[in-house]
């Protein structure tokens, strides 16, 4: 028995930020779960993790340097990615594991979302910017 995941086929990040919503065929209310977002065809990079527990508040973290936040719905987790670089344009896959109460469940691999980062090239700002124009 597998959880099905729906994602938008493509999202464009115009300002180096994007909201990616992962919709599940499973209600996460009162479950202990680990939702994650993975980058690349081989899902090699774990971009962001949202860990939910019935007794604690949501934990959101990235171990790979991404600036991310997460929000929980009854049957969805939305990942908010900021400060994306143009070269991080790639396919991103939602993953979900429900641990407690049993049974352990995970998802069928989704089709993924291509995130096209079109925003400003994030460059360090100059030390002495010129005078601002009125």
């Amino acid at each position: 028995n597998k959880i099905l995941v729906k994602q938008s086929p493509m999202l464009v990040a115009y300002d180096n930020a994007v909201n990616l919503s992962c919709k599940y065929s499973y209600n996460l209310f009162s479950r202990e779960f680990r939702a994650s977002l993975h980058k690349g065809l081989d899902s090699a990079v774990e971009v962001c993790v949202v860990y939910g527990n019935y007794s604690q508040q949501l934990q959101v973290y990235s171990k790979t340097g991404f600036n991310c936040d997460g929000k929980l719905g009854n049957e969805s987790v939305t990942f908010y990615l900021q400060n994306l670089y143009v070269n991080q344009t790639d396919i991103y896959f939602c993953k979900i594991e429900v641990m407690y109460p049993p049974p352990y469940l995970d998802n069928e691999k989704s089709n993924g979302t291509i995130i096209h980062v079109k925003g400003k090239h994030l460059c360090p700002s100059p030390l002495f910017p010129g005078p601002s124009k009125p």
């Epitope: 680990r34 019935y54 594991e97 641990m99 407690y100 109460p101 049993p102 049974p103 352990y104």
Partner: antibody
């Protein structure tokens, strides 16, 4: 036949680490729903769940040991490992690996590995 | 953590006796009609052996004299007619909530 075979007994000094292996045969660590759990039993005491690794590679630990334990698996050799660091005398116990179902009952057990922590 | 309290801690019985061991959880271990409570038998120097899973399902190969019942917080393991090989320690275990926990054990000794 389905079985789990563990590595041999270990004697360790306080503050050191130990790594116990558990080789599965007759089933695959990659099979959906399967996890390998680690459980320990101090001399004359009851059973304590340490944590487990799921077929997906995700790990889950008992909060009481989380800072000191690492569970890994090598699917190519069907072997799971449990490493416990910063050992103290209270960690002296028999360490068991066990196959966990999706409902987390343990239907196949290893023979146990005695880890003795002594200065 | 969910605490499991077994009673009695030990008991003496004779071959042929009906033996009942109880396990009480500090909170319900039921979810969607399933009780996540299991029973194990352990003999000295050996690994535990699964007897009953999901409160009342008999593990394959386990003699039918073993049975489990209960729901919510109160569970029972019954051995209908004690056999010589049944003298051992019995543990209950919950997997409803992390961390998985075990009862302290009930030692069944020969009277």
């Amino acid at each position: 036949q389905v079985q789990l075979v563990q590595s041999g007994a270990e004697v360790k000094k306080p503050g050191s680490s130990v790594k116990v292996s558990c080789k599965a045969s007759g089933f695959s660590l990659s099979t959906g729903g399967v996890a390998v759990a680690w459980i320990r039993q101090a001399p004359g005491q009851g059973l304590e769940w340490i944590g487990q690794i799921y077929y997906s590679g995700s790990t889950y630990y008992n909060p009481s040991l989380k800072s000191r334990v690492t569970i890994t698996a090598d699917k190519s050799t069907s072997t799971a490992y449990m490493e416990l660091s910063s050992l103290r005398s209270e960690d002296t116990a028999v360490y068991y690996c066990a196959r966990s179902s999706a409902h987390y009952y343990f239907d196949v057990w290893g023979q146990g590995t005695l880890v003795t922590v002594s200065s | 953590d969910i605490q499991l309290t077994q009673s009695p801690s030990s008991l003496s019985a004779s071959v042929g006796d009906r033996v009942t061991i109880t396990c009480r959880a500090s909170e319900s271990v039921d979810f969607q009609g399933i009780s996540f409570l299991d029973w194990y038998q352990q003999k000295p120097g050996k690994a535990p052996k699964l007897l009953i899973y999901d409160a009342s399902s008999l593990e394959s190969g386990v003699p039918s004299r073993f049975s489990g019942s209960g729901s919510g917080t109160d569970f029972t393991l019954t051995i209908s007619s004690l056999q010589p090989e049944d003298f051992a320690t019995y543990y209950c275990q919950q997997s409803y909530r992390s961390p998985i926990t075990f009862g302290q054990g009930t030692k069944v000794e020969i009277k």
